[in-house]
């Protein structure tokens, strides 16, 4: 369950996360498999670990090999894998197949490639984009953040698409390319204005005091790949992370799951330990995209709570 | 309701095995780490086993090499395998509820079966 | 491992008054996110055990406001304000830092 594949280019850049992630404050220790050796944390080595993360910097063929990461959480120490794969770098241009990352496909409408794995890096923008090793030139081409943005798809666009930025670690600076395929759908997708499928408007919810209460934002916005859609909570009428209590969480990463074609996002709001102020607060679910905003309004009240030991 | 019910408890003689089974209901039962704890008779409780949401398995001395512990999510279901059994393992068996294993959510061990009785005797 | 030692082994206590309990861990029970990883549990008899108190001092859902737990380390106290009849049976202090270890029990009975 908690084993992933990671994979790099001697002389590049490569981090890794551990697989089995904990909350920012547990320790993760890191140790090369075979040997059983501690994987040090100090930057002044090539390899080292710094909490959830392991750095190769750069990477040698050498490193790879399976690194085990064992989170310091209450009552376990959990432990994940990471299956690590450095490569030699090819002298031409064909990007292997070993060497690529998840197949993304877009649309006329849509054609946004995430670089992989740059939440990892320390980069600075711009990224470098190229498509079968050229670099891309021409207004077309918008480099924007983390993706790239493709004007007017057309079917010859489909192709293999590297990303190469620079990773900087206390002032030395590492290259990380990463290569994606993108297809071409020629089917014609379309936005809607928003529709919420849960929770329905002025939904009472029911929580039982003291307990973990989750809510989901359900809506979708139309057929194909959508260029913007966001659903999100607020909580009188506050961003969640701006409203300030830790005990209310907004679930990261939003699915984009396609039920009968069209595209809809999930949104899981978190609360946990229901206090009783919980219940006199407004919680808004909110989808949005090019055509507008819609809201729906869920009040809390509070479920007799049921005696399990009796 | 939140549930726990655990079966599979009877006599068995030493060197001998038996299977406990609890059944979970109510909840996500797949998120959380799951847990035994025994109660010898007139005595405390003693921690026996766990299994966390990636079936990582967690076992004290005295057990360890004896039981297994295994869960089935799609049965919303808890096994303990319990081999080479020995007098000192009669107790009443309890499955009970950990903590969140997906969110690191913790509220204490807050649910508990109603226990089975395994007895080892000759 | 981390041994948890209770006392007193039992408490007669006087309904209307308060009681407390004392657990002693054989190591801090602090973990690095802040929280102490100390419960409490009351077995009735007859009855599976039942929480009280989670993280040293947070009471369980439908747990009456009269229990109270405090402390911090390795030293924590369950406090009673006022013992009812009901509360009678074995209280036991768990650490969930590290596995789960038990204290021994205290036996609440009515004088």
């Known amino acids: 369950k908690f084993s992933k594949q990671s994979w790099g280019l001697e002389n590049e850049a490569l981090i890794v996360r551990c697989p089995r992630q904990g909350k920012p404050s547990y320790t993760v220790d890191w140790y090369y498999s075979q040997t059983n050796k501690s994987i040090p944390t100090q930057e002044r080595n090539r390899v080292f670990a710094s909490g959830q993360l392991l750095k190769f910097l750069p990477a040698a063929v050498a490193d790879s090999g399976i690194y085990t990461c064992i989170v310091r959480s209450p009552t376990f120490n959990r432990t994940g894998y990471a299956n690590v794969t450095i490569y030699k770098k090819q002298s031409d241009c064909n990007v292997p197949d070993y060497l690529m990352y998840s197949t993304v496909s877009g649309s006329e409408k849509n054609s946004k490639i995430y670089c992989p794995t740059i939440d990892l890096y320390n980069w600075t923008a711009p990224l470098e984009w190229f498509k079968n090793c050229q670099a891309l030139q021409g207004s077309r081409y918008r480099a924007h953040k983390s993706f790239l943005v493709i004007d007017n798809v057309m079917t010859e666009d489909a192709g293999d698409y590297t990303c190469k930025f620079i990773h900087n670690e206390n002032g030395a600076n590492y290259s990380v390319t990463a290569t994606r395929s993108f297809t071409v759908k020629d089917e014609q997708g379309f936005s809607l204005f928003p529709v919420i499928g849960a929770p329905a408007q002025n939904e009472i919810k029911e929580v039982e005091i003291g307990k973990n209460a989750n809510l989901t934002c359900s809506a979708c916005f139309g057929k194909g790949t959508q260029f913007l859609a966001a659903v999100l909570w607020q909580l009188n009428g506050t961003k969640i992370t701006d409203f300030g209590e830790p005990r209310i969480q907004q679930e990261e990463g939003q699915n984009q799951s396609f039920s009968n074609g069209l595209a809809c996002l999930d949104m899981v709001l978190r609360i946990a330990d229901v206090k009783e102020e919980d219940l006199l607060l407004q919680y808004d679910c909110l989808a949005l995209n090019l055509h507008g905003l819609r809201r729906h309004t869920v009040r809390l009240s509070r479920k007799n709570p049921i005696d399990h030991h009796s | 309701e939140v549930q726990l019910v655990e079966s599979g408890g009877g006599l068995v003689q030493p060197g001998g095995s038996l299977r406990l089974s609890c059944a979970a209901s109510?909840?996500?039962?797949?998120?959380?780490?799951m847990h035994w704890v025994r109660q010898t008779t007139g005595k405390g409780l003693e921690w026996v086993s766990a299994?966390?949401?990636?079936?990582?398995?967690y076992y004290p001395g005295s057990v360890k090499g004896r039981f297994t512990i295994s869960r089935e999510d799609a049965k919303n279901s808890l096994y303990l395998q319990m081999n080479s059994l020995r007098a000192g393992d009669t107790a009443v068996y309890y499955c009970?509820?950990?903590?969140?294993?997906?969110?690191?959510?913790?509220?204490?061990?807050?649910?508990w079966g109603q226990g089975t009785t395994v007895t080892v005797s000759s | 491992d981390i041994v948890m030692t209770q006392s007193p082994l039992s408490l007669p206590v006087t309904p209307g008054e308060p009681a407390s309990i004392s657990c002693r861990s054989s190591?801090?029970?602090?973990?690095?996110?802040?929280?102490?990883?100390l419960d409490w549990y009351l077995q009735k008899p007859g009855q599976s055990p039942q929480l009280l108190i989670y993280?040293?001092?947070n009471r369980a859902s439908g747990v009456p406001d009269r229990f109270s737990g405090s402390g911090s380390g390795t030293d924590f106290t369950l406090n009673i304000s006022r013992v009812e009849a009901e509360d009678v049976g074995v209280y036991y202090c768990?650490?969930?830092?590290?596995?789960?270890?038990f204290g021994g029990g205290t036996k609440v009975e009515i004088k």
């Open positions: 009970a509820r950990g903590g969140d294993g997906y969110n690191y959510d913790y509220y204490g061990i807050d649910v």
């Open positions: 109510g909840f996500t039962f797949s998120t959380y780490d």
């Open positions: 299994i966390d949401l990636a079936g990582d398995t």
């Open positions: 190591q801090s029970l602090l973990h690095s996110d802040g929280y102490h990883y």
């Open positions: 993280l040293g001092s």
């Open positions: 768990m650490q969930a830092l590290q596995t789960l270890t």
